[in-house]
């Protein structure tokens, strides 16, 4: 079997999607329900744990124990205002465990509490299993996507979720970057193009501006709102219908979790309908206290309900343009990503903002991120397909990186949206006379004061010779590599003394020795994989040739053109080879090639004799090759599972 494929997972707030790059193209993989996206839902019942469609389908019956939106919790503290705000909307309980949020549910009759990483890992496990069912072998390597605005701790927590799911997370990449890759593969245009990616999904909103030039992607700017998406539009509909129910039936259903959940499901369905129809109806039997709720909503009313939300999507567009130092006229392509970009009003607002520019909707908006992640996974696994081998991904630092200077000021060395890898150096000095050392505190964030930003790590540079304040020269270098690993070095220029810190996003890192051993093993496996790939390629070439030759001489059109003796000679040899193949699927490359050459030695002279004067190819599209005319092995299969 060829090298196992790596998968790309779009771990969405509301829905997740998995893809794999094989045979030169991306396959978005359907789950066991035939759906190409899977709800990011986990349900706990008295008897079992459900993930995906099965979990979402029973949410109305079991709202307290059906967990969704784990992505809104992951990598956040319990006291985070976002967590506190979101908790109000969730039917499941979130508890505080050392300022870490945990979801508390009843499972098999017991109270259990799970970290967001654990819930996300369950969704990732489901996506892994979906891929394995399709591919037919175990999958371990994956690229997982996150919103552009995820900070270090959110990215690390997502990576941890992958590890818990038994995945080797090759890389965490930004969702818009993944979408850009997907889009780039569909483009064959020449020259540099500025592309604006507008990603409005179920839970996050990201705007990215990228430059795509001959397969090279560079993220110029990102902006967005980590808390805007389809669910917010659902909430507007839910609130609208709660009010309507009050008016019609004089009853408030808002405190009945099951009723609200059932209403929300119907609202989501209506919202989807309104993208293609101007009206949608809701029919919910016995919604509350035995009352059936039959109603409808027009597209115009829906647009009115969400008008401020829809309009707010343009603010990050303007911000991204400013950050990229581009005018809207300089954007060549507008790309829609995320299911919510199907909403006609959203499309119209964007189109109008760009003075009627056509929107690129060629990529299925629900699948574009997973598509790109799958391509990136293939790149990281060393896929040699011509579709991907020239692709270079220049990602960006999602947040500014800097250090604390006097007075708790955040001094950024690497600005947000800087293309990575990057390296920046700046000279700092002492604050006090005869200061013997400096404390280097590394932060990420956009706020002016470090207290409002995220501390990544700290280290001390000591042994500075006594000197008046402002005299010592401390050279600080921030160096971030393609994997987002940050090295911060501080050097006292007078003594050459230096100290450094590596911020890797990896708690519990492997030792140098283990990494070295794994690198060596990886090299060994890479060589083994190549041998295996060549072996399978040789096997397939032999198999193709044998079956093609067999069908060629059995072709009715050859009656009278080929002697029975020659026909028998070819068929006997083909039979020998085909049977040998069946019995020797694990033979070596040399053996397959030897058999193919043997078969060619028998078949080529006979087949070419038939077409010598015909001036056309032989049966099955084979050219009549003269001596030394090539291997004659027919069409080879370039990629094999």
């Amino acid at each position: 079997m060829a090298k196992a494929a790596a998968i790309g997972i779009d771990l969405g707030t509301t829905y997740s999607c998995v893809g794999v790059f094989q045979h030169g193209k991306v396959e978005i993989i359907a789950n066991d329900q035939g759906n190409r996206t899977t709800p990011s839902y986990v349900a706990f019942t008295d008897t079992e744990r459900l993930i995906g469609d099965a979990a979402k389908n029973q949410v109305a019956l079991n709202p307290q124990n059906t967990v969704f939106d784990a992505k809104r919790l992951i990598g956040r503290k319990f006291g985070d205002p976002v967590v506190q705000s979101d908790m109000k909307h969730w039917p499941f309980q979130v508890i505080n465990d050392g300022d870490k949020p945990k979801v508390q549910v009843s499972y098999k009759g017991e109270t259990k509490a799970f970290y967001p990483e654990e819930i996300s890992s369950m969704v990732l496990t489901k996506m892994k299993e979906i891929a394995e069912a399709y591919l037919g072998y175990p999958v371990t390597n994956a690229v997982i996507t996150v919103p552009a605005y995820f900070n270090d701790s959110q990215r690390q927590a997502t990576k941890d979720a992958g590890v818990i799911a038994g995945l080797n997370v090759l890389r965490i990449i930004n969702e818009p970057t993944a979408a850009a890759i997907a889009y780039g593969l569909d483009r064959t245009g020449k020259g540099e193009r500025n592309v604006l990616i507008f990603d409005l999904g179920g839970g996050t909103f990201d705007v990215s501006i990228l430059t795509i030039d001959d397969g090279i992607f560079e993220v110029k700017a990102t902006a967005g709102d980590t808390h805007l998406g389809g669910e917010d539009f659902d909430n507007r509909l839910v609130n609208h219908f709660v009010e309507e129910f009050k008016r019609k039936h004089k009853k408030d259903i808002s405190q009945n979790k099951r009723a609200v959940r059932r209403l929300r499901t119907a609202c989501e369905r209506a919202k989807r309908t309104l993208s293609s129809s101007t009206q949608a109806s809701l029919e919910i039997d016995s919604l509350f206290e035995g009352i059936d709720f039959y109603t409808s909503i027009t597209r115009a009313r829906f647009e009115e309900l969400c008008s401020d939300l829809f309009r707010s999507t343009l603010e990050p567009v303007e911000k991204a343009l400013r950050d990229a130092k581009l005018d809207k006229a300089q954007i060549h392509d507008l790309v829609l990503v995320g299911g919510s970009t199907r909403i006609p009003k959203v499309q119209k607002l964007l189109q109008d903002f760009f003075n009627g520019r056509d929107l690129n909707k060629s990529i299925n908006p629900d699948e574009a991120v997973a598509y790109g992640a799958a391509v990136q996974a293939a790149i990281l696994m060393g896929d040699k397909s011509e579709n991907v081998q020239d692709l270079l991904l220049l990602d960006v630092a999602p947040l500014s990186l800097g250090l604390e200077t006097a007075g708790g000021v955040m001094t950024a060395l690497i600005k947000r949206n800087s293309t990575i890898p990057t390296k920046q150096t700046q000279i700092f000095t002492t604050y006090s006379d005869n200061q013997p050392g400096v404390l280097i505190q590394v932060y990420e964030g956009e706020r002016a004061m470090t207290k409002d930003n995220n501390l990544l790590g700290r280290f001390e540079l000591s042994g500075i010779p006594p000197a008046p304040r402002g005299v010592p020269q401390i050279e600080v270098t921030f160096d971030i590599d393609a994997n987002g690993i940050l090295n911060v070095t501080a050097t006292d220029k007078s003594t050459g003394k230096a100290n450094k810190i590596t911020i890797t996003n990896d708690k519990g890192r492997l030792s140098k020795e283990e990494i070295e051993r794994m690198v060596q093993e990886a090299e060994k496996y890479k060589a083994e994989d190549e041998v295996q790939r060549e072996r399978v390629s040789a096997k397939n070439a032999l198999e193709s040739y044998a079956f093609n030759m067999k069908s060629a001489v059995e072709d009715e059109g050859l009656k009278g053109k080929i002697s029975e003796a020659d026909k028998k000679k070819v068929l006997d040899k083909c039979q020998e080879v085909i049977s040998w193949l069946d019995a020797n699927t694990l033979a070596e490359k040399d053996e397959f090639e030897h058999k193919r050459k043997e078969l060619e030695q028998v078949c080529n002279p006979i087949i070419s004799g038939l077409y010598q004067g015909a001036g056309g190819p032989g049966p099955g599209g084979f050219g009549a090759q003269g001596p030394k005319g090539g291997s004659g092995s027919g069409p080879t299969i370039e990629e094999v599972d």
């Epitope: 040998w580 030897h594 080529n604």
Partner: antibody, heavy 116, light 112 residues
Framework: QIQLVQSGAEVKKPGASVKVSCKAS????????MNWVRQAPGQGLEWMGW????????TYADDFKGRFTFTTDTSTSTAYMELRSLRSDDTAVYFC?????????WGQGTLVTVSS | EIVLTQSPDSLAVSLGERATINCKSS????????????LAWYQQKAGQSPKLLIY???TRESGVPDRFSGSGSGTDFTLTIDSLQAEDVAVYYC????????FGGGTKVEIK
């Protein structure tokens, strides 16, 4: 009648090269593969590999990869075996043999002696 | 790689007597599709080129006397010379063509 006629004996110094020819007659050269077999003095037969005379693609046995090259010239119905960087243990008789269901016709053999 | 082991290394048989040479393969040489075993026998007289005697275990090459016969299947094969003649003094080699080609080490047949 079918015949395979090989070139004459060669005496070479270590490090030199030798090219043995095998001229076929009496049949269509490109319809049958040509094998090469080595026999060191007092030893058994060793299969070196073969060449597909129709496509010119060679196959080498594991022990004969690297210094050995099989070629053909279809215009003269001749197969060649070249051996580079000769060593003393390359001293042997080299046979060419046509292959149908087996090696049905053999050349008379060419003795290559490697000596300093 | 398939290894062929011949036994005995040498054998002395009286004129007119039967000579039996064995060849054991490290893996089966049987092809279920063609129902054939891909084993051949060659004779090499002193100072001469080898000569094909038998292929596909038991099919005699044209012109080969019928005192030469081959048998066996799978991994165990036998060449039998029914009534040894003086001109049969030679070294006999088995060769497999099931996958790539390999010769056995040879069996020297002499007159007793």
């Amino acid at each position: 009648q079918i015949q395979l006629v090989q070139s004459g004996a060669e005496v070479k110094k270590p490090g030199a090269s030798v090219k043995v020819s095998c001229k076929a007659s009496g049949y269509t050269f490109t319809n049958y593969g040509m094998n090469w077999v080595r026999q060191a003095p007092g030893q058994g037969l060793e299969w070196m590999g073969w060449i597909n005379t129709y496509t010119g693609e060679p196959t080498y046995a594991d022990d004969f990869k690297g210094r050995f090259t099989f070629t053909t010239d279809t215009s003269t119905s001749t197969a060649y075996m070249e051996l580079r960087s000769l060593r003393s243990d390359d001293t042997a008789v080299y046979f060419c043999a046509r292959y149908d269901h087996a090696m049905d016709y053999w050349g008379q053999g060419t003795l290559v002696t490697v000596s300093s | 790689e398939i290894v062929l082991t011949q036994s005995p290394d040498s054998l002395a048989v009286s004129l007119g007597e039967r000579a039996t040479i064995n060849c054991k393969s490290s893996q089966s040489l049987f092809n279920s599709g063609t129902r054939k075993n891909y084993l051949a026998w060659y004779q090499q007289k002193a100072g001469q080129s080898p000569k094909l005697l038998i292929y596909w275990t038991s099919t005699r090459e044209s012109g080969v006397p019928d005192r030469f016969s081959g048998s066996g299947s799978g991994t165990d094969f036998t060449l039998t010379i029914d009534s040894l003649q003086a001109e049969d003094v030679a070294v006999y080699y088995c060769k497999q063509s099931y996958t790539l080609y390999t010769f056995g080490g040879g069996t020297k047949v002499e007159i007793k």
